[in-house]
Amino acid sequence: RRRRRDTHFPICIFCCGCCHRSKCGMCCKT
């Protein structure tokens, strides 16, 4: 599990159609 102090920071991954975008790229979400 993530440490408590990390919980408000996003995790970033490559994906397609993520982060309200139609193409492929990096997407960071909490």
């Epitope: 990390d6 920071f9 975008r21």
Partner: antibody, heavy 121, light 106 residues
């Protein structure tokens, strides 16, 4: 103003280690992903590694995986690149670069001036 | 993955320069473009295919569809002479730069 300043480069023998630093100023360092990108003499740009907001969320190019380690100290506004088992082909100018702000940080919007690493016997 | 750029492009002052960046399904991912002058660090000129960072002149524009992204410089000026690199993500561990294009303003 927004600035990235690399240091720690130099001449090192094959198989040895070196640690690069990148001091950030003028922005909230912890709010940005940070990259290392290198450029061999007379050649193009090559991505090396990225570390995102959480220190455990990091990725490496295949060419350096297992030899290089990217890390950050948000309290010191500093990015690091620990380079072990150096090879002649690692000779390059090493740039630190800031990832764009926001949910979709595809591009590198701020670059440092670079620090030269020469691996030679 | 590879992104292929022409090694060099020449243009007369005031004319339009187009620099291409070709790669497998390039149009399905976001392209960024960087300008690098001799002895200097790269500068971001286009991101997310078509967007210009603040401070970048309007003469710089971009497009991306099919297998090719294109950087267009309209009304090219002498100060635009530089190397230009495209860049795209292919996975979380695979950021790819093109080989670079040397733009010469004749």
């Amino acid at each position: 103003q927004v600035q990235l300043v690399e240091s720690g480069g130099g001449v090192v023998q094959p198989g040895r280690s070196l640690r690069l630093s990148c001091a950030a100023s003028g922005f909230t360092f912890s709010n940005y992903g940070m990259h290392w990108v290198r450029q061999a003499p007379g050649k193009g740009l090559e991505w090396v590694a990225v570390i995102w907001y959480v220190g455990s969320n990091k990725y490496y190019a295949d060419s350096v995986k297992g030899r290089f380690t990217i890390s950050r100290d948000n309290s010191k506004n500093t990015l690091y690149l620990q380079m072990n088992s150096l090879r002649a082909e690692d000779t390059a100018v090493y740039y630190c670069a800031r990832a764009q702000e926001g949910m979709a940080p595809d591009a590198f919007d701020i670059w440092g001036q670079g620090t030269m690493v020469t691996v030679s016997s | 993955y590879e992104l292929t750029q022409p090694p060099s492009v020449s243009v007369s002052p005031g004319q339009t320069a187009s620099i291409t960046c070709s790669g497998d399904k390039m149009g399905e991912r976001y392209a960024s473009w960087y300008q690098q002058k001799p002895g200097q660090s790269p500068i971001l000129v286009i991101y997310q295919d078509t967007k210009r960072p603040s401070g970048i002149p309007e003469r710089f524009s971009g497009s991306n569809s099919g297998n090719t992204a294109t950087l267009t410089i309209s009304g090219t000026q002498a100060m635009d002479e530089a190397d230009y690199y495209c860049q795209a993500w292919y996975s979380s561990t695979n950021v790819v730069f093109g080989g670079g294009t040397k733009l010469t303003v004749l």
